[in-house]
């Protein structure tokens, strides 16, 4: 039979290669079948018999067509600061990502070694760059004509409302207060809105981290002034 319709195992033509989903076995010197994802080579091929495949055992997997003698072990269970976004199956490894509100601060070869909490932007500052799976939030001062009155890892600086008659002028941390006539929103400089995914809580949004193999965000109004830029009541 010509090589292109040969059944495995078969000897490749001189200088030729094996077909898709086949591999060249050095011992048998034949083109032999690979095993499909979720299986591994239980018995390697010989000159007269093809590869014998077997299913991966529990907690092991193969993701690609292969001829490995043993399936790969799935990663350990996700640590407490991570959530499982893909379960371990015979065909895929477990995937862990940092919890919502956290990001991967210290990565490892596959996935995340340590997750850390995302910073938030204080009133008067808005999110310049939202947190991602692997980076912290970046804040910026609200430009003139814009404000943020929240402590949040998602809220950007928003434009002050424009009043026909201003009762209280707005500042970086407070919107303008108008007299009873209806206000309008300005499109003040610096009020460019960050593209964000669909909201998952009230009117606030969270960055949606792309998963990684093993192990990236919030809000609300202060009750009075925001915490001081010092620290302790204990001195």
């Amino acid at each position: 039979l010509p090589a292109q319709v040969a059944f495995t195992p078969y000897a490749p033509e001189p200088g030729g290669t094996c077909r898709l989903r086949e591999y060249y076995d050095q011992t048998a010197q034949m083109c032999c079948s690979k095993c499909p994802p979720g299986q591994h080579a239980k018995v390697f091929c010989t000159k007269t018999s093809d590869t014998v495949c077997d299913s991966c055992e529990d907690s092991t997997y193969t993701q690609l067509w292969n001829w490995v003698p043993e399936c790969l072990s799935c990663g350990s269970r996700c640590s407490s600061d991570q959530v499982e976004t893909q379960a371990c199956t015979r065909e895929q490894n477990r995937i862990c990502t940092c919890r919502p509100g956290w990001y991967c601060a210290l990565s490892k070869q596959e996935g995340c070694r340590l997750c850390a909490q995302l910073r938030k932007c204080r009133p008067g500052f808005g999110v310049a760059r939202p947190g991602t799976e692997t980076s912290d939030v970046v804040c910026k001062p609200c430009a003139p004509g814009t404000f943020s009155n929240t402590t949040s890892s998602t809220d950007i600086c928003r434009p002050h409302q424009i009043c026909h008659v201003v009762a209280i002028p707005g500042n970086a941390s407070m919107d303008a207060v108008c007299t009873s006539t209806s206000p309008t929103r300005s499109m003040a400089p610096g009020a460019v809105h960050l593209p964000q995914p669909v909201s998952t809580r009230s009117q606030h949004t969270q960055p949606t981290p792309a998963p990684s193999t093993a192990p990236g965000t919030s809000f609300l109004l202060p009750v009075g002034p925001s915490p001081p830029a010092e620290g302790s009541t204990g001195d």
């Epitope: 601060a105 340590l114 850390a116 909490q117 204080r122 620290g231 009541t233």
Partner: antibody
Framework: EVQLVESGGGLVQPGGSLRLSCAAS????????ISWVRQAPGKGLEWVAY????????DYATWVNGRFTISLDNSKNTLYLQMNSLRAEDTAVYYC??????????????????WGQGTLVTVSS | DIQMTQSPSSLSASVGDRVTITCRAS??????LAWYQQKPGKAPKLLIY???DLASGVPSRFSGSGSGTDFTLTISSLQPEDFATYYC????????????FGGGTKVEIK
Amino acid sequence: EVQLVESGGGLVQPGGSLRLSCAASGIDFSSYGISWVRQAPGKGLEWVAYIYPDYGSTDYATWVNGRFTISLDNSKNTLYLQMNSLRAEDTAVYYCASGYASSSGYYDPKYFGLWGQGTLVTVSS
Amino acid sequence: DIQMTQSPSSLSASVGDRVTITCRASEDIESYLAWYQQKPGKAPKLLIYDASDLASGVPSRFSGSGSGTDFTLTISSLQPEDFATYYCQHGFYTSRSDSVFGGGTKVEIK
């Protein structure tokens, strides 16, 4: 003025229970993650537990072993630490501590910038 | 679990001395480290965060350096009010944490 004030400490027998409170003024706990940190007499600081209100998540030091529960009453803007099965080695000053608010506009929950004055818990028969 | 080890556990120094305290993490924590000062009967006070950034209101004689596993707190010229205990802390407190703070370094008057 922004401050945290702990209360509820006192003398309790081994095996007993106690509930500590931490009342906040000037900040809304629902925006700010907050921890309990303790310090045994003459010893160092020891992180106990953390609550992240936005996501309803809690974390505990490995040695807590389910004996303590951290919780938050948003309506009272008060943090709690319910401590059960108390042992002599739980004797300590218990502090509530919140993240650091920097002058450059960040609130960073990884570090403790705001502390209460502490409340003493003594476990003894 | 990341373990934080401080050295020395105590030291004696005089006003005007340059004082250096070290903190070693059991694994790489990049720059996620803070330093605190605590005086007897008082709550701790944040001095340095992210290994080298000075917290608001902290005198410039305090400085922090290091990354990875080895960190240093330096007081360039010790003042009378600096006699206290100093602690380092890593920024990864979660349910797999046990040791978050170092054991402390007591700075005493010589």
